[in-house]
Structures are given as C-alpha cells and as structure tokens.
C-alpha cells in the first residue's frame, strides 16, 4: 500500500509510470500501485528517493541527454537536486534541463532540454505535480542531535532505513539517524510519532489533564519548534492561568536555558498572541520585557529566572515546550446568532442573544462607564469571538478614531485580565505592541481603538467613550424584519444585501443558486465587509461558506466570479499554497479566514447583490 508520502511518477502522454528496474536502469512501465519499483518519495526539499532501492534519482552531470539513474542519497550533491518548474515540469535545480521520457531508442528516463509533453509528469491518480506531495522535515526528540531533523534514508549497522525504526531496541521506540550515516556520525533522535511508551515523553498535569513536553536538549528556531509540536498534534505552550505557570515553573526548575513558548507578535497588525489561539490574558514578563527592539517577536520562558518570559529574535536556537490535551476554553459556548431571538431596546443593537450600545459622546473614566452600563441593565462589553468583535466594528457604528472602554481589566489580580461581567476570557485581540502594561503607570483597563478595533491596556482614569452590552430579553418567536432595500431573508450591510445559502452545494452549484436569485457568490472588498461577513456566518456550526473567489479560470490567479478586481485578501495560514481550487470562509476558531478547497466539495454559501434604491458609486480608476 502507498503511504501518504509515496507516489508514482506518471506521464500522461504515454500513460505510463517511472519504474526503477535496477539502480542503473530507471525506465517506464504500465502503472501499478503495488509495484515497489514504481514508488518514490521526497526525502529532502530537493531529493527524490526510490522506495524499492532506498537510493535517490540523480544524474552523472548537468548536461543534455544523460541518463537519470539511482545514486546513494547525498544531500550535498548538486546532481540529485530536483525542483518543480512551471506546471508539471521537473528539472534539475538551477538548470533548464528536465526529467524526460526518453524515446524509442532510449528506454531510460533522460535529462533533456525539451519541455514538451514528454517532460511533463504528475502524481499518478491526481492532477497534481510532484511537488504537491513535498517533503516535510521531521524534528527528533531526545537523542543526541539537539532535535535535528531525520535524514532519510540513513544507514544503521550497514542497513539502510527510509523510515523511523525500532532497530537495536526491544521496547518499540521509533528513532532515526539525523545524518545519512549513523554508523559513522552516531547522531540520532526519537521520532515524534505514536508508539508504545511515547506517552512518557509528556508530563500530565493531574489537575487539568493537560500534557506538556519539555524539549530542553533541542536547539531549534521558534518556527521549527512550533512545527515539531504540531507534528505531535500539539502546539507550542500557551499559559492562560496562574496555576499553569506554577506547574511549569516546577517542571522546569532544574533547567537553566531558555525554552520557546507559543507567545509571539508575528502578526503584522496585531499585538502579543499565543500560537494556539488561546487568549493572551495572563502576563509573566521578565522585568524589562517585552523589549521594543524590532525583530524580537518570539518569546522564551526562562527557567533560571523563575520561568518568566522574555522576547527574543525568532531565529535563535533554543529548547521548547509543547502542550496538548483539553483546554479549559471550550466549556464556554457562545450561542450562534441564528439560535437566539434577540430583542433590544431602542438605540441598542442585537447580536447573538445580546444587545450593544456605543456611548461615544459622554466620556467617562472606566469605573464610571462600568457604573453607567450596569445602571442600564448591562456591563461594559465582553468580547468572546472574532465574530463578536467584527459585529461591533461593522454594525455598531464604530469609527476608526474611536477609543472606547471595554470590560477587560486586571484590577483584581495584577497581570491577569478578566471581564467585568464575569464571563471567561476566551479571546483577545491586542493592538501591535500591546498589552504594554507600562511600569511607570498602572495600565489596568482596556480600550478598543484604531481602524480594526484591536485592544490596548490603558490607565483606568482616562475619560473615554465606552461600549455597553446586556442580555437581550426574548419575547416569543422572532419577527423577521425586512431590511430596507433587501428582500425577506436577506441581510443589509452598507450598499448590499446578503443571504446565506442553506443547501450544501459545490462551488458551481452555489454560484448557479446565487445567479438564480439575481445575485452572485459574495465578493469581499475590504476589511469592513470581511468583518460583517465574519459576524454573519462565523458562529454557525457549518465549517465552510463559499465565496465567489477561485482560480478555476487561470491556475494560480484567483478571481471573483463577477468582473471585480481582487483588492483585499484574508487567507488562513498556509493559504493559498500551491493547490488550485475555490475559496471558502472558515467558521469557528479561524472565523472568517479564507481556505482553498476542492471546488466539488459541498458547503453552504453567501450570495450578494446591490440593495434596491442604492446609487452605484463609480468604479475606481486605476
């Protein structure tokens, strides 16, 4: 059976696959997924290994019309380095010489300057090029190689291994060499895979059942450390509770060097955040941290300094801490907007079972603002999801120059932020450089400010506007209001009407449904429309909603289904990547972010059209 990293190299023109007959004969044959001789896999960023021989595809020289055969894998050899060129060409790195079918006289696969159909290769059974099943480095644990990546294939006791092995062990623990010759270099580490006994790599907190892995012997950059955690279905450490910090202080007390944790300010326009999307509500900085020096965007925990945190350059090589298991954040359920009939007094705006009101003109210190909200039957607003924040920004009349109190504060316990309405902290969205908690003045209260409505801590004695929130009063079944300029069941935002398509549909079916409604799959023109759409669909239980964006017409170039320029994007991490497809908005923890899906997947969708009676603004000139 093919494992997910293995593939057959297929030439569509001949409908045949590459077949390693012997190390010196790499030819083609009728495709057979059970033939070991036809299985290949990437073993580094640029090397392709024959699974049958555990040898790598290479050439004797970078010249036209030489035979491609198999060689002992050598990550330094220029003659074994391959790269995908445009579309389905595979070429030797740095040259316009391609992996070619050969010809009637030449049965062997050849290196050739021609880029026609005989030089075009796909993964058998797919439309993808060979790089779509690229190499993913596997970071080792423990061992003696400072967490270096596995080197496949590697030699142990004169035998070659293309996967992690338990050779030499009686307990089933899986390991790999981190250089191609373990016998000479003696460098190895354990693989971040599940095997009997691998749970002893983790320390479980008996109180919370959360597990932590301390990799103090490793030396990785922040991004490498994060990847290593993710390879174990975990994330770099987040700390949201004082108990958790105490437990980790104990766990790391015998160590001296810094360890990467998930805290970072890598997002261009927002502040400190945890990589696992936990709220940044507990602060434990080392005195003098975070330093404002540019580039110091990643955070380490310092065992030698009472496990306090320090921001460093992300390329430094340190140990790291991974975390997995139940988080306490999921116990607080925010009702979906559609689940709750929301009735609000005049001048209050409804959303998901609550009513909201901005007090902009009567500026008050935080304490007085809180008192006013409570007198009105509510509290300073708490915000629990990106959808709720985006509702406030897009539909409450929030303005880019606003600076408004919200309910977050650390008045009760210093450096531990809580909502004044007592709801749990499940979400934070700090401005760049925030929370700063400047030492020379107590910044115990929090404001929303700037065009995106992100947050900053502030001295509580500043007179500012504020946002109140209260539970709505249900009054029997909700009356569906018809919004001016929109048909029944459509929701208005600025000049447009929007409707959720409730039938699970492919991209094409969704597009057709919208067209039948004299509308189109939604475009997204800017941050504010995105905010509206996030609040519109983000809390719904379905995972995806189609937008009108795809690269169906020109692979690699994303376009809307209507003739409109793509002026704004909101990609999820690792998107759009190399894969072609159609774009859908995520819900849940990644609410509103865009993912590329296969166009024939089924999802709900959002239709959009001009509201009636609206004058179309002129098209922007370029």
């Amino acid at each position: 059976l093919l494992d997910t990293r293995q593939f057959l190299i297929y030439n569509e023109d001949h409908k045949r696959c590459v077949d390693a007959v012997s190390p010196s004969a790499v030819q083609t044959a009728a495709c057979n997924q059970d033939a070991e001789s036809q299985k290949f896999r990437w073993v580094s960023e640029s090397q392709i290994m024959s699974v049958a021989f555990k040898l790598c595809l290479g050439v004797p020289s970078k010249t036209d019309w030489v035979a491609i055969t198999l060689y002992a894998c050598d990550s330094k050899s220029e003659f074994q380095k391959w790269e995908c060129k445009n579309d389905t060409l595979l070429g030797i790195k740095g040259e316009d010489l391609f992996f070619n079918y050969g010809n009637r006289q030449e049965k062997n696969i050849m290196l050739y300057k021609g880029s026609g159909l005989w030089s075009r290769w796909k993964i058998y059974g797919t439309t993808d090029n060979l790089c779509s099943r690229g190499y993913e480095a596997m970071y080792t644990l423990l061992g003696n190689a400072n967490g270096a990546t596995c080197a496949f294939p590697f030699k142990f006791e004169n035998k070659w291994y293309a996967d992690c092995t338990s050779a030499g062990r009686s307990d089933g623990w899986l390991w790999c060499g981190t250089t191609t010759d373990y016998d000479t270099d003696k460098l190895f580490g354990y693989c971040p895979l599940k095997f009997e006994g691998s749970e002893s790599l983790w320390n479980k907190d008996p109180l919370t059942s959360v597990s932590y892995q301390i990799n103090s012997k490793s030396a990785l950059t922040w991004h490498q450390a994060r990847k290593s955690c993710q390879q174990q279905n975990a994330e770099l450490l987040s700390i949201t509770e004082i108990h958790e910090q105490t437990y980790l202080t104990g766990l790391t007390s015998s160590l001296t060097s810094g360890l990467w944790i998930g805290l970072n300010s890598l997002s261009f326009n927002s502040g400190w955040q945890w990589s696992d999307r936990s709220p940044f509500r507990y602060l434990n900085w080392l005195p003098g941290s975070p330093s404002a020096e540019p580039g110091k965007s990643c955070v380490s925990l310092n065992p030698g300094k009472n496990a306090k945190w320090e921001n460093l350059e992300c390329v430094q090589k340190l140990g790291y801490i991974c975390k997995k298991g139940n988080t306490t954040l999921n116990s607080f359920v925010i009702p979906s907007e559609s689940d709750v009939p929301t009735h609000c007094p005049s001048q209050w705006w409804p959303y998901a079972g609550h009513c909201y009101k901005i007090h902009r003109d009567e500026k008050k210190i935080q304490r007085d603002a809180l008192t006013t909200c409570r007198k009105e039957g509510g509290d300073l607003t708490s915000i629990h999801t990106i959808e709720e924040l985006d509702f406030i920004i897009s539909q409450l009349g929030y303005e880019p120059n606003d600076e408004l109190w919200i309910g977050l504060n650390d008045i009760k316990i210093q450096m531990y932020f809580e909502w004044s309405d007592g709801t749990p902290v499940t979400f934070t969205k700090w401005l760049r450089g925030e929370p700063s908690h400047e030492n020379n003045r107590q910044e115990d209260c929090v404001v929303m400010k700037g065009k995106d409505g992100y947050w900053a801590d502030r001295g509580c004695e500043w007179p500012l506007g504020y946002i109140c929130k209260m539970k709505s009063r249900s009054q029997g079944p909700e009356i569906v209001e018809v919004e001016k300029g929109c048909r029944k069941g459509w929701k208005k935002h600025h000049f447009y009407c929007y409707m959720i398509g409730h039938t699970l549909s492919t991209f094409a079916e969704a597009n057709q449904t919208c067209n039948n409604e004299n509308a189109y799959l939604t475009t997204i023109e800017d941050r504010y429309e995105q905010a509206f759409l996030t609040s519109f669909v983000g809390l719904r239980p379905e995972k995806y909603f189609w937008t009108g964006l795809s690269d169906i017409q020109t692979k690699g170039t994303f376009q809307w289904t209507i003739e409109e320029e793509v002026r704004f994007t909101h990609w999820n991490s690792d998107m759009p990547g190399r894969k072609p497809g159609c774009v859908a908005m995520r819900t849940g923890i990644a609410g509103g972010l865009w993912d590329v899906l296969k166009c024939d997947e089924k999802a709900k969708f959002v239709c959009k059209h001009w509201a009636e009676g609206v004058t179309h603004p002129p098209k922007p000139t370029t």
Partner: nanobody, 119 residues
Framework: DVQLVESGGGLVQPGGSLRLSCAAS????????MGWYRQAPGKQREEVAA???????NYADSVKGRFTISRDNAKNTVYLQMNSLKPEDTAVYYC?????????????WGQGTLVTVSS
C-alpha cells in the same frame, strides 16, 4: 553511557532468602523496563522476572510465588526478593534495563552477581 551495578548475591542455604538490587546510572531519560535473568553453568541465560515503568510484572513459572520483583523509579533501581530458595536457583543473576538514552540501543546489562544455594 548507561551502567548497571548488581549487588546482594552470595551463599545461602536451601529454604533461605536473598535480596538482589540493581542500580542504573548514566545519561538516562527514562527506563521502560527492568528485569532479572540468570545463567546456570552450562545452560542458556533465562528470564526470571521483569517489571515495566508502569509497574506490570512478569515471572518465569519456576519462580512464581517465591520471587518478587519491585522497583524504585526515583532511584532507578530494581530489586529481586528471593524466598524459599532451592539448589536449582544457583546461577549468575544478571540485571537488564531497557532504557531511553543517548544512543538508539535500548538494552543494557550488568556484570552479574553469583547466587549459590547449597547446604
């Protein structure tokens, strides 16, 4: 690397008792299992008893009910309490540890301690 040091062997009369101990030291991350093996003159080495990190135990039929294996995780030490000893228990007793350490090899052996059961 990993060193195992056994102690507690000696001469004992039939029906008597002995307690063997084996301490592991070196660059050990974790010990997955520890056990006792024995080799009588002219015979193959055989497993006597083993204990996993979780505390599960296993005994050879010939010693069940007479020998007890136990472990002190904090000290990386394993013990073998031998009661009702018989002449056929005479052998060199070896300690084995299955460890996670700085080489990929897992099995480490002690030098052995001689147990003689004779009147």
């Amino acid at each position: 690397d990993v060193q195992l040091v056994e102690s507690g062997g000696g001469l004992v009369q039939p029906g008597g008792s002995l307690r063997l101990s084996c301490a592991a030291s070196g660059s050990i991350f974790t010990i997955n299992a520890m056990g006792w093996y024995r080799q009588a003159p002219g015979k193959q080495r055989e497993e006597v008893a083993a204990i996993t990190s979780g505390g599960s135990t296993n005994y050879a039929d010939s010693v069940k009910g007479r020998f007890t294996i136990s472990r002190d995780n904090a000290k990386n030490t394993v013990y073998l309490q031998m009661n009702s000893l018989k002449p056929e228990d005479t052998a060199v007793y070896y300690c084995k540890a299955v460890v996670v350490t700085t080489t990929p090899y897992s099995d480490y052996w002690g030098q052995g301690t001689l147990v003689t059961v004779s009147s």
